[in-house]
């Protein structure tokens, strides 16, 4: 395989997007590079332009179709190549036979909202975005709550081992500002990883009623 000192990592969002990151030791000259996708059993192929994300790494998104269209299945294999311009030609810099459903990373959950808030608890719901119907209920979630004076990294992780698109946070402090995030992961796929964290949802618990425990 062509690899040299480079690393080429891609994930499928389970619907119509493959996101790739390519890193190369030893900076390249100002040259244009692309990712090419050639499925083994589809009529289409797709290309995206790699754009720098740091001094030695580039990223791009292969848009395979409409966001909610199911463009690949568990039996598909996609040959992914990094091609860089040299003279008038393209040179293959990295290559992999990509099995989409072994390399899943879903989109971050969306539409986070507070369903109900009290002094010590808060019920929050969310939706998953662009997730394949193939998963049925085979998804898990992780959630975290940011308390005042703490960082996200310090926040304990709450694990939901089933497809449950809500959570009831308990033992909260009254009249306190919190932030909440959630991420999702399919149970399928050897190299599957967690989605990015959702946009944080800010909420405030209700103040304790004077002389009354809520």
């Amino acid at each position: 395989a062509v690899n040299g000192t480079s690393q080429f990592t891609c994930f499928y969002n389970s619907r119509a997007n493959i996101s790739c990151v390519w890193s190369q030791d030893g900076a390249l000259q100002d040259t244009s590079c692309q990712v090419h996708a050639w499925p083994d059993r589809r009529r289409w192929n797709q290309t995206c332009e790699l754009l720098p994300v740091s001094q030695a790494s580039w990223a791009c998104n292969l848009i395979l179709g409409a966001p909610d269209s199911q463009k690949l299945t568990t039996v598909d294999i996609v040959t992914l190549r990094v091609l860089c311009r040299e003279g008038v030609r393209w040179r293959v810099m990295a290559i992999q036979d990509f099995k989409p459903f072994e390399n899943l990373r879903l989109m971050a959950p969306i539409s986070l909202q507070v369903v109900h808030v009290e002094t010590h608890r808060c019920n929050i719901s969310w939706e998953i975005s662009q997730a394949s119907h193939y998963f049925e209920r085979h998804l898990e979630f992780e959630a975290r709550t940011l308390s005042p004076g703490h960082t996200w990294e310090e926040a304990p992780l709450l694990t939901l081992k089933q497809k449950q698109e809500w959570i009831c946070l308990e033992t909260l402090t009254p009249d306190t500002q919190y932030e909440f995030q959630v991420r999702v992961k399919p149970l399928q796929g050897e190299f599957t990883t967690w989605s990015p964290w959702s946009q944080p949802l800010a909420f405030r618990t209700k103040p304790a009623a004077l002389g009354k425990d809520t």
Epitope: V2, G4, S6, E86, R89, W90, R91
Partner: antibody, heavy 121, light 112 residues
């Protein structure tokens, strides 16, 4: 069958220009690169540069920059190499050769028969 | 530019005997993708060059298996296991790893 057929021998005076043609057949002309290589009498091979007929994009060896121009006419599947300000050292056989647009394995697979250019006063 | 140096300049060989040509590059010709684009061309008398070997050791289609290539980094070798009459000509090494691509000066193989 892949074939690259080049134009006939040329005799030029110093300071003049020469334009060599290379007609391709047996494959899709716009899917491959055409490289130009020259061989001075009794000497080795020298890569001059190349053109991608698909979009007309060119790359020239620094050694020939400013003197060489590579063009193509896709309607007749023909590539051209023009060398200007000729001097006696440019007396050579000029070859065109086909190359894959994506350099996966090798630079040039099929070659033309060569065009002899003689520069003499 | 990468300078490719071949030796010997001339190689007289006996029919049926092996022959070996050396090619040395002035710098490492491993491309940043990890591949080594070292090729060998044969030019028979009065003919155009013909691709024999690519990426150090891969035979191009139609090339007899008596031709083999080896080497790495900066040192490469073309071997003919048993020389035949049709093998007479000049052999060139070529590097396609670093632009501008360059050829060796050639080795002339002739029958003793």
């Amino acid at each position: 069958e892949v074939q690259l057929v080049q134009s006939g021998a040329e005799v030029k005076k110093p300071g003049a220009s020469v334009k060599v043609s290379c007609k391709a057949s047996g494959y899709t002309f716009t899917d491959y690169v055409i490289s130009w290589v020259r061989q001075a009498t009794g000497q080795g091979l020298e890569w001059m540069g190349e053109i991608y007929p698909g979009d007309g994009n060119t790359y020239y060896n620094e050694m020939f920059k400013g003197r060489v121009t590579m063009t193509r006419d896709t309607s007749i599947s023909t590539a051209y190499m023009e060398l200007s300000s000729l001097r006696s050292e440019d007396t050579a056989v000029y070859y065109c050769a086909r190359g894959s647009y994506t350099y996966d394995n090798y630079a040039m697979d099929f070659w033309g028969q060569g065009t002899t250019v003689t520069v003499s006063s | 530019d990468v300078v490719m140096t071949q030796s010997p300049l001339s190689l007289p060989v006996t029919l049926g005997q092996p022959a070996s040509i050396s090619c040395r590059s002035s710098q490492n010709i491993v491309h940043s993708n990890g591949q080594t684009y070292l090729e060998w061309f044969q030019q028979r008398p009065g003919q155009s060059p013909r691709l024999l070997i690519y990426k150090v050791s891969n035979r191009f289609s139609g090339v007899p298996d008596r031709f083999s290539g080896s080497g790495s980094g900066t040192d490469f070798t073309l071997k003919i296991s048993r020389v035949e009459a049709e093998d007479v000509g000049v052999y060139y090494c070529f590097q396609g790893s670093h632009i501008p691509w360059t050829f060796g000066g050639g080795t002339k193989v002739e029958i003793k």
